[in-house]
Interface confidence: low
């Protein structure tokens, strides 16, 4: 903690400006008014303060707002956000998506820190659920965000938020997570027509049951092999050769290259050889 000392004559800061980078730590403590700092936080980011100087500024804000910073200050924290502990952030009430974006921008390119995790927690708690706009923002900064949540957590995501999910956001999701997300996606996209529906639902199909795959096979969707390989094995096994042929369309030839890998391998073993022969791919059951 910085020792309390009187401000030297003529050094009292009338505003937050570049001259403050020449102040020693004790001078910043003595000569910068905390209320002034709070109202001019937006200027701090433009001034190349040292980490030690930022520590002093944080200390001043902590003294001014012992119960937690107001959102007007939080929104303009900039790099000072990196100085905050999860304990500091737990005192905040962040409700504006603009504030969340501003702080995530500061951490951009870095792994999700405990500070960011706590900030997101506070924000989502304030909103009551992980809504579409929030999910849009979070996945833009952390494409793997959705897949970092447990199935239990994902169950609180409303179907309307699924519109914000991009295919790459699901790249690292495991089958249990897709089991939770797929019914939500099915609900979210239910009013779309066949081809548009398939484009949207495709990335979620790792959670689809057999009956939905059978229904898709009747719609000329031409599923690519990459999507087929991500389907649940237990959902693929009951499909007939004719259904798989319809589901994959022209991509059915790709089964040969994948015949040793699940779920193709397990599916082949469940089929009658004369049914497999109708594909003309030389698949051996």
């Amino acid at each position: 903690e910085v020792e309390k000392t009187a401000c030297p004559s003529g050094k009292k800061a009338p505003e937050i400006d570049e001259s403050l980078i020449f102040y020693k730590k004790w001078e910043l403590e003595a000569c910068v008014d905390a209320a002034l700092l709070a109202t001019q936080m937006d200027r701090v980011n433009a001034i190349p303060f040292t980490y030690e100087q930022l520590d002093v500024l944080k200390h001043k804000l902590d003294e001014l707002y012992p119960q937690g910073y107001p959102e007007s200050v939080i929104q303009h924290l900039g790099y000072l956000f990196l100085k905050m502990s999860p304990e500091d952030i737990r005192k905040w009430n962040v409700t504006s998506l603009e504030t969340l974006k501003a702080l995530l921008e500061v951490n951009k390119g870095h792994e999700m820190s405990p500070q960011v995790a706590t900030l997101i927690d506070r924000f989502v708690k304030g909103r009551g659920q992980l809504d579409k706009d929030t999910l849009d923002t979070l996945t833009a900064f952390y494409p793997g965000y959705l897949c970092s949540l447990s199935p239990e957590e994902l169950s609180s995501v409303p179907p309307s938020s699924i519109w914000a999910v991009r295919p790459q956001d699901l790249d690292t999701c495991d089958p249990r997570q897709l089991d939770v997300l797929y019914p939500k996606a099915r609900l979210a996209f239910q009013n779309m027509n066949g081809s548009e529906y398939f484009v949207k639902i495709q990335s979620f199909l790792g959670g689809a049951p057999t009956e939905d795959l059978k229904a898709l096979s009747q719609q000329n969707v031409s599923m690519d092999l990459a999507t087929f390989m991500k389907l649940r094995t237990d959902a693929v096994l009951p499909l007939t050769v004719a259904e798989v042929q319809k589901l994959l369309g022209p991509h059915v030839e790709g089964l040969k290259a994948e015949e040793r890998h699940r779920p193709v391998r397990d599916w082949i073993l469940r089929q009658r050889q004369d049914d497999l022969d109708t594909l003309g791919l030389g698949l051996q059951g």
């Epitope: 009430n93 997101i120 927690d121």
Partner: antibody
Framework: QVQLKQSGPGLVQPSQSLSITCTVS????????VHWVRQSPGKGLEWLGV???????DYNAAFISRLSISKDNSKSQVFFKMNSLQADDTAMYYC?????????????????WGQGTSVTVSS | DVVMTQTPLSLPVSLGDQASISCRSS???????????LHWYLQKPGQSPKLLIY???NRFSGVPDRFSGSGSGTDFTLKISRVEAEDLGVYFC?????????FGGGTKLEIK
């Protein structure tokens, strides 16, 4: 599946310290907090403290001077240490997961509990 | 600290009956965000407590729908619509709105 397994001594001498390790599986300590609770016939269930996912701690003021909670995320272990034990600290000590990480509240229920460590303070 | 008072201390019931347990807090459990962090646990003999209901009325995964929670502010109730043998044990209410988190003294559900 989510599990919390506790290891620690059953008998502690008066004025000595108690150390318990809670090893978790099925979830990451980076995402979830862990609480410590004790239960004795005389005082019922008492919340002792918590270590949050970010590593910060909150303690029950009644125990703050002699309680320390820490963790090693990479080993999935949470460490509980209480000093200067007396006979009335005899209890069953539990670790429990804070049922919420990034999108749920940090002030949530304790959704999974360890099997408990029975501690007797006696010479 | 917030004091949690449960009534009754003991609740003798017949299997198939409805059971109701009350929990009262010494101060409001409404958090600054508007959520109320009041939870219910069941502890069977020789076991750790298990979460039944979180945030007043939300059933935890795997908890049968015969369990329901209600209440607001300082007064809360746990109801079991048709008691089964596996429901016997000690029920605790708990608050996590204020630090330190605190628990009720427990209500023992037993066969009449």
């Amino acid at each position: 599946q989510v599990q919390l397994k506790q290891s620690g001594p059953g008998l502690v001498q008066p004025s000595q310290s108690l150390s318990i390790t809670c090893t978790v599986s099925g979830f990451s300590l980076f995402s979830y907090g862990v609480h410590w609770v004790r239960q004795s016939p005389g005082k019922g269930l008492e919340w002792l403290g918590v270590i949050w996912s970010g590593g910060s701690t909150d303690y029950n003021a009644a125990f703050i001077s002699r309680l320390s909670i820490s963790k090693d995320n990479s080993k999935s272990q949470v460490f509980f240490k209480m000093n200067s034990l007396q006979a009335d600290d005899t209890a069953m000590y539990y670790c429990a997961r804070n049922g919420g990480s990034m999108i749920t509240t940090l002030y949530y229920a304790m959704d999974y509990w360890g099997q408990g460590t029975s501690v007797t303070v006696s010479s | 600290d917030v004091v949690m008072t449960q009534t009754p201390l003991s609740l003798p019931v017949s299997l198939g009956d409805q059971a109701s347990i009350s929990c009262r807090s010494s101060q409001s459990l409404v958090h600054s965000y508007g959520n109320t962090y009041l939870h219910w646990y069941l502890q069977k003999p020789g076991q750790s407590p298990k979460l039944l209901i979180y945030k007043v009325s939300n059933r935890f995964s795997g908890v049968p729908d015969r369990f329901s929670g209600s209440g607001s502010g300082t007064d809360f109730t746990l109801k079991i619509s048709r008691v089964e043998a596996e429901d016997l044990g000690v029920y605790f209410c708990s608050q996590s709105t204020h630090i330190p988190f605190t628990f009720g003294g427990g209500t023992k559900l037993e066969i009449k």
